[in-house]
């Protein structure tokens, strides 16, 4: 039960995290105009990974895309790449983890396969989260560097007669969304990896033997202490192929129409 909960929670946390990474990547407010210690302007600038925007006091907002690829700073390209890799890995991880969820049965998928898929998705979530955190951190570092550079030569001009105020940029909302989302994806991935350990079957897989009695069938399972009788709705003799004890909620049932997703 704890394994199912851990896996389910890991999936949900990762899902929220990846949604956040996508949102952060699309957001325009990666960097916003620094208003502290600056002349109050009637124009507010903010920039994203894909476009820069200007919001006027009039309420008019104008956004311009970065229509060049080669002219953009290498760091910005690197951040874009990290975020996209994070999203792609996260999306694949989500897809894999859906099939790995214990609460969803696909045919007669082995527990070992589910365990492997859970581990795979967990690793993908961890890498996805790290990519997002790295991308956001690289951008933040770039901002800090530029901030202090522009502060050092904030006022430039000919002989100090004419002043040109350089626009300084500080952390935008997208950075915080990205950090939190990356962290959530990372935590979700760790949870999936933990869940994988609980899902993995025992190392010793004994073949169960079926003894046929004349009256009713009694299957003796070497791995467990419980003898399962043939009494019940299904009176056919059953072969038990899996060794090792199973909890009640793990007893395999015949596939029903609801089992195929």
């Amino acid at each position: 039960m704890a394994v199912t909960a851990c896996q389910g929670l890991g999936f949900v946390v990762s899902l929220i995290g990846i949604a956040g990474i996508i949102a952060a990547t699309c957001m325009d407010q990666w960097s916003t105009q620094d208003l502290y210690n600056n002349p109050v302007t009637a124009v507010f600038n903010y920039q994203g990974l894909w476009r820069s925007c200007v919001r006027e006091s009039s309420g008019f907002t104008e956004c311009r895309g970065y229509f060049t690829l080669l002219g953009l700073p290498a760091m910005l390209q690197a951040v874009r790449a990290l975020m996209i890799v994070g999203i792609v890995l996260g999306a694949i991880g989500l897809l894999v983890s859906i099939f790995a969820l214990k609460c969803i049965r696909i045919g007669s998928m082995e527990d070992s396969a589910k365990a492997n898929m859970t581990l795979t998705s967990g690793i993908m979530f961890i890498v996805s989260g790290l990519c997002a955190i790295a991308g956001v951190s690289v951008f933040a570092n770039m901002l800090v560097t530029n901030f202090w550079m522009s502060t050092a030569n904030m006022y430039t001009g000919m002989g100090g007669m004419v002043q040109t105020v350089q626009t300084r940029y500080t952390f935008g909302a997208a950075l915080f969304v990205g950090w939190v989302a990356g962290g959530l994806t990372l935590i979700g991935g760790v949870m999936m990896c933990i869940a994988c350990r609980g899902l993995a079957p025992e190392e010793t897989n004994y073949k169960a033997v079926s003894y046929h009695a004349s009256g009713h069938s009694v299957a003796y399972k070497p791995g467990g202490f419980k003898a399962s009788t043939g009494f019940g709705s299904n009176t056919k003799n059953k072969k038990i192929y899996d060794g090792g004890a199973r909890t009640e909620d793990e007893v395999q049932s015949y596939p029903s129409k609801h089992d195929y997703v």
């Epitope: 124009v43 200007v54 309420g59």
Partner: antibody, heavy 118, light 113 residues
């Protein structure tokens, strides 16, 4: 078309108060800011400040903080300028203007002359 | 506050001749975010409210005759009336729309010679 219609001229005594109105029509009133501009006789234009009809937020130029108050009645698409404790130097024509894209004043009221005299 | 300095104070030009008004700002009005200069030009005739001619330093307001043109960037701007008409007699103001408080130039009176 966009129109800003201001109230008529006012003659006031020093120390009195005056309220100038600016009625907007031809556009969605809450979408654009209303600015107030003063022009003393024979002088240039002075920006007093503006009010955002969407939020009610106001911004005043330093010399117009205190006795000058901008307000709104969005139900009748009207902006108001109230001046209290009037002084002789407040004698001027007061204009309201709509703040449009490009932070430009694209439409102006006809102006309201406020004369302060004892 | 940003100081807007207009020159000359008054200008007398013959009909059909070119009139040029200059405006200098104490700080750059160029916004790096959209590469626009937040400067507007207004025309005011006696007894009338100002009328917008140019915004973003060089964009002509709709309905304004094309003899009016604006140029310049950063701190230095120019309003040009390519061929002065009798109805152009007025006072012209430049106004910066980038920093609070928004400020106007002192005005330039254009007359016919």
């Amino acid at each position: 078309q966009v129109q800003l219609v201001q109230s008529g001229s006012e003659l006031k005594k020093p120390g009195a108060s005056v309220k100038v109105s600016c009625k907007a029509s031809g556009y969605t009133f809450t979408n654009y800011g209303i600015n107030w501009v003063r022009q003393a006789p024979g002088q240039g234009l002075e920006w007093m400040g503006w009010i955002n009809p969407n939020t009610g937020e106001t911004t005043y130029a330093e010399e117009f903080k205190g006795r000058f108050v901008f307000s709104l009645d969005t139900s009748v698409s009207t902006a108001y300028l109230q001046i209290s404790s009037l002084k002789a130097e407040d004698t001027a024509v007061y204009f309201c203007a709509r703040l449009y894209y490009g932070n430009r004043f694209d439409s102006w009221g006809q102006g309201t002359l406020v004369t302060v005299s004892s | 506050d940003i100081v807007m300095t207009q020159s000359p104070d008054s200008l007398a030009v013959s009909l059909g001749e070119r009139a040029t008004i200059n405006c200098k700002s104490s700080q750059s009005l160029l916004n790096s975010g959209n590469q626009r200069n937040y400067l507007a030009w207004y025309q005011q005739k006696p007894g009338q409210p100002p009328k917008l001619l140019i915004y973003w330093a060089s964009t002509r307001e709709s309905g304004v005759p094309d003899r009016f043109s604006g140029s310049g960037s950063g701190t230095d701007f120019t309003l040009t009336i390519s061929s002065l008409q009798a109805e152009d007699v007025a006072v012209y103001y430049c106004q910066q729309a980038y920093y609070y408080p928004l400020t106007f130039g002192g005005g330039t009176k254009v007359e016919i010679k």
